[in-house]
Interface confidence: low
Amino acid sequence: AMFIVKNGNGTACIMANFSAAFSVNYDTKSGPKNMTFDLPSDAKVVLNSSSCGKENTSDPSLVIAFGRGQTLTLNFTRNATRYSVQLMSFVYNLSDTHLFPNASSKEIKTVESITDIRADIDKKYRCVSGTQVHMNNVTVTLHDATIQAYLSNSSFSREETRCEQDRPSPTTAPPAPPSPSPSPVPESPSVDKYNVSGTNGTCLLASMGLQLNLTYERKDNTTVTRLLNINPNKTLASGSCGAHLVTLELHSEGSTVLLFQFGMNASSSRFFLQGIQLNTTLPDARDPAFKAANSSLRALQATVGNSYKCNAEEHVRVTKAFSVNIFKVWVQAFKVEGGQFGSVEECLLDENNM
């Protein structure tokens, strides 16, 4: 959608054209919940809050409102040669029961973050790839963005500054044309280390590469299977420690949230991967908001105090349409002594290969 801020004499000083996806973590009475939603088509510029700024005293700002009290604000700043979105802030209203069902508090929250959105003066900022801005409990992903502030003639400049993600790196091939289903197999995902700590120390250590296997219907009614690698460099990990449940939450690009839940069988003193939940956005899907969950898994099992290790690729089927391929997994949940993996329990696949 296009958003424009004008000054008193009707001249545009900010123009922005983008779509945005939001991923928000919030608390419900039954535990933490994640909601993903897109900037709706009826989002509006808040004219009395947006501003072209005043010479040397204040900077331009674009304030976009939607729903019941949600506002996305882009605050711009400049020097002699460049301008940038110095700060992005998002105000969300947990009493908006459409967006945040069963929220345990009904307050208005504000989160903010600096951004990488910057361009040369008198050039527009252009980014076709997703631009993610991570804030506390919120990730905002801008797609297909054209943004320009400090406009001189009420229209986007012809020249542009492209975002880093859009520039082909020396090692990458140009983007492939749309592929028939199934998609070509991507290379194995990078392995990364994750740990979750609580008041009593570390409750989860994990080292693994993650690949999502998604089957969905596209807008043209064809069914496609895609393999998506979780890129550790573009992933934020968090989680929680509980007596009976340990969670690892991964926020990745494209407003992807992948949640692992580890449970424990008290009688046998074994931990296991009990649940996986995925929320992501698939722009070419008939229903772009892809959600899948299963909380009755029994994978990656080992005795509490030991670690589970598997060099072979493991496939964990979550639903008919979604499975997770886990590469080179080494994981330990609940009891982690000294921040180190304990005795290893190898997976059957590895033992059979020995």
Epitope: N48, R68, G69, S95, T97, K106, E107
Partner: antibody, heavy 118, light 106 residues
Framework: QVQLQQSGAELVKPGASVKMSCKAS????????IHWVKKSPGQGLEWIGA????????PYSQKFKDKATLTADKSSSTTYMQLSRLTSEDSAVYYC???????????WGQGTLVSVSA | DIQMTQSPPSLSASLGGKVTITCKAS??????MAWYQDKPGKGPRLLIH???TLQPGIPSRFSGSGSGRDYSFSISNLEPEDIATYYC????????FGGGTKLEIK
Amino acid sequence: QVQLQQSGAELVKPGASVKMSCKASGYIFTNYNIHWVKKSPGQGLEWIGAIYPGNGDAPYSQKFKDKATLTADKSSSTTYMQLSRLTSEDSAVYYCVRANWDVAFAYWGQGTLVSVSA
Amino acid sequence: DIQMTQSPPSLSASLGGKVTITCKASQDIDRYMAWYQDKPGKGPRLLIHDTSTLQPGIPSRFSGSGSGRDYSFSISNLEPEDIATYYCLQYDNLWTFGGGTKLEIK
């Protein structure tokens, strides 16, 4: 805890204006809307409007948009409602209510009685 | 503004009996409906929100249902303290109260 302290009863003459206050405490003032509700024997409960003190934004009911003016003073955490060109129809108890659009977590003030009489 | 049409304006029922009040919205309010009890000299008391969710401390004799534009509120096993005026309130788009229903005991 959340409290809304409203100003005292007012006896005013027809044609005059009255300005009542609602002082908030026990929460972050700029995070919640303050709604105003009229309770009268003839008309029952009527929603007048609301103000979001964070930015002064104030939507009104169509019926009251020329009658009521809502303002907020962040420094004193106080919301004001001014009623103009008063008639006997405006005699009522006026409540301020802290709530975002959801009502389940609403807090009501004790009410301000306005009597319009010559 | 969304309009709320509440009926009946008044009703009379026997102790131990059951009454039902209805409210019709001028447009779909997506179950954002509440019911208040109002007594003279007191502030309004919220009984039900989100169409059917009882507020803490409200007896289960009170109930609500509905969807879209049509909503209803019932009190069963009527007691003397239920004598009051009852109002519906939509809060899907700003707020609008219904006209009220005055309940009397026969």
